[in-house]
């Protein structure tokens, strides 16, 4: 068998670090057998069999000019093998960050913090951190480690499915190359990394007969679980065209009636979502939707949701008090089940 341990990576390649002493090993001989070393395609003897180094070639302070293919020959001139030298660096700890778009799963991405120049792979795992006792942290068998399954096609991402919202996790991402391994440990709490996707289906409609009103509606992001135990709250911003500043409101449900729109001007509207109890951070803003308040008079048929507003708005009426906001039924999803085992009925 070969005296040369096979490093992780392509066969026939051996590895070293620039500026360091590098030993090349002749693969086709017995350990200690004296060999001669040549650069491939060059007749000059690099190291003879009388060097006392047996089957190894020593390159002091290797640099890029030493990279390439080497040939070793036994005393009788037989080919002992060919070796390709590739120089690079041991792994540095990768940079890791994790994010969650819902409260049941999270993903972690990583980047090398230094390019090694060598074949590299990543080992990804996680364990659930369980604290037992006042100030001792002990592991129970159920806490892992478990593999964090990596995305196919080499994307630097792994996903933990079925995570527990209240638990802490320790992510392990280890960068491995032929010169070693280096590990980054990252402690993750789903509560702190939760950032929902932005709300979807944002629509902005005029309210017939009300030249200062716009009705915006939207839906939960598709990535949020269909029957959520944890709910979302929303933030809505709007502004007239060409106006630099946004006005912000926090709607009670999945729609909002804007009562101070500028008559006749198109308005941009966008919404953002966050966990109902303020875990994590606000989502990015949804794509803007546009709407223009109606200019006509109030219709004879008043929409059911607008029955409170029986007086048409007359512009300009600077001093007139704004009519009461429409009373929106709470959406069933806006009931917080986080601390409740029972289902709460919404009475219409």
């Amino acid at each position: 068998s070969s005296p040369c341990p096979q490093a992780w990576g392509p066969p026939g390649v051996q590895y070293g670090q620039p500026g360091r002493s590098v030993k090349l090993c002749c693969p086709g001989v017995t350990a200690g057998d004296p060999v001669s070393w040549f650069r491939d395609g060059e007749p000059k003897l690099l190291q003879g069999p009388d060097s006392g180094l047996g089957h190894e070639l020593v390159l002091a302070q290797a640099d890029s000019t030493d990279e390439g293919t080497y040939i070793c020959q036994t005393l009788d001139g037989a080919l002992g093998g060919t070796v390709t030298l590739q120089l690079g660096y041991p792994p540095a700890r990768p940079v890791v960050s994790c994010q969650a778009a819902d409260y049941e799963n999270f993903s972690c991405t990583w980047s090398p913090s230094q390019i090694s120049g060598l074949p590299t792979r990543y080992l990804t795992s996680y364990r659930k951190k369980t604290v037992l006792g006042a100030d001792s942290q002990r592991r129970s068998p159920s806490t892992g480690p478990w593999p964090c399954p990596q995305d196919p096609l080499g994307a630097a991402r792994c996903v933990v499915h079925g995570a527990e919202f209240w638990s802490q996790y320790r992510i392990n991402v280890t960068e491995v190359n032929p010169l070693g391994a280096s590990t980054r440990l990252l402690d993750v709490s789903l509560q702190s990394i939760l950032r929902p996707d932005p709300p979807q289906g944002l629509r902005v409609e005029s309210v017939p007969g009300y030249p200062r009103r716009l009705r915006a509606s939207w839906t939960y992001p598709a990535s949020w679980p269909c029957q959520p135990h944890f709910l979302l709250k929303f933030r809505l911003q709007y502004r007239p065209a060409q106006h630099p500043a946004w006005s912000t409101v926090e709607p009670a449900g999945l729609e909002e009636v804007i009562t101070d729109a500028v008559a006749g001007l198109p308005h941009a509207v966008r919404v953002s979502a966050r966990d109902f109890l303020d875990a994590g951070t606000w989502s990015t803003w949804s794509p803007e939707a546009w709407g223009t308040p109606s200019t006509g008079t109030i219709p004879k048929e008043i929409p059911a949701w607008g029955q409170l507003h029986t007086q048409p708005e007359v512009e300009p009426q600077v001093d007139s008090p704004a009519p009461p906001r429409p009373s929106l039924q709470p959406h069933p999803r806006l009931l917080d089940h986080r601390d409740s085992v029972e289902q709460v009925a919404v009475l219409a």
């Epitope: 660096y89 540095a92 940079v95 960050s97 991405t109 980047s111 090398p112 913090s113 230094q114 390019i115």
Partner: antibody, heavy 118, light 107 residues
Framework: EVQLLESGGGLVQPGGSLRLSCAAS????????MTWVRQAPGKGLEWVSS????????QYADSVKGRFTISRDNSKNTLYLQMNSLRAEDTAVYYC???????????WGRGTLVTVSS | DIQMTQSPSSLSASVGDRVTITCQAS??????VEWYQQKPGKAPKLLIY???NLQTGVPSRFSGSGSGTDFTFTISSLQPEDIATYYC?????????FGPGTKVDIK
């Protein structure tokens, strides 16, 4: 010669913006994480921001988050720091520094002075 | 953020003296600590990495030790050119932090 050279510092009013650059030479810039560290006059060192070789991960000190943006152009061997909404407390010498790895700084530039004052 | 405390804040010693600076982290940082030397008007220079490894080209009179939360930096025989401020720094997590520095001068 292995070196880092910062530029772009100067006097700016509070609320203003400035863009710092750091030109790298003598090493394979695209292989290393890069960092900005600052030092207020007569004070200690404060880490500001770092970026991985690919640019895919960045990190900021809480004191600059949302106001500063770190970026790099590997084709130009240059690191940048875009500084917006500047405050008097951002007055400092800004150094750019090279990895190895993340958070380890084995090569520093000479620094560029940023003064925020009205 | 991890806080790094350094002591003393300043010291005076004679040429040839052994000088010791300590650094304490507010939480375990494994061995991910570096020591820097900064001379007036100059950029910092890396002396020690990974708590105890001497950076290439740095004189062997400089050394470091420690792990977890407690770290020590030593100049075995102080030289006139060692007048400077010395900083410890942790890089265990993604937000590195520096100690406040120790100013070293000659008696």
């Amino acid at each position: 010669e292995v070196q880092l050279l910062e530029s772009g510092g100067g006097l700016v009013q509070p609320g203003g913006s400035l863009r710092l650059s750091c030109a790298a030479s003598g090493f394979t810039f695209s292989w290393y994480s890069m960092t900005w560290v600052r030092q207020a006059p007569g004070k200690g060192l404060e880490w500001v921001s770092s970026i991985v070789p690919s640019g895919g991960h960045t990190q900021y000190a809480d004191s600059v988050k949302g106001r500063f943006t770190i970026s790099r152009d590997n084709s130009k061997n240059t690191l940048y720091l875009q500084m917006n909404s500047l405050r008097a407390e951002d007055t400092a010498v800004y150094y750019c520094a090279k990895g190895p790895g993340w958070g380890s700084f084995d090569l520093w530039g000479r620094g560029t002075l940023v003064t925020v004052s009205s | 953020d991890i806080q790094m405390t350094q002591s003393p804040s300043s010291l005076s010693a004679s040429v040839g003296d052994r000088v010791t600076i300590t650094c304490q982290a507010s939480q375990d940082v494994s061995g991910y600590v570096e020591w820097y030397q900064q001379k007036p008007g100059k950029a910092p220079k890396l002396l020690i990495y990974d708590a105890s490894n001497l950076q290439t080209g740095v004189p062997s009179r400089f050394s470091g030790s420690g792990s977890g939360t407690d770290f020590t930096f030593t100049i075995s025989s102080l030289q006139p050119e060692d007048i400077a401020t010395y900083y410890c720094q942790q890089y265990d997590n993604l937000s590195p932090t520096f100690g406040p520095g120790t100013k070293v001068d000659i008696k």
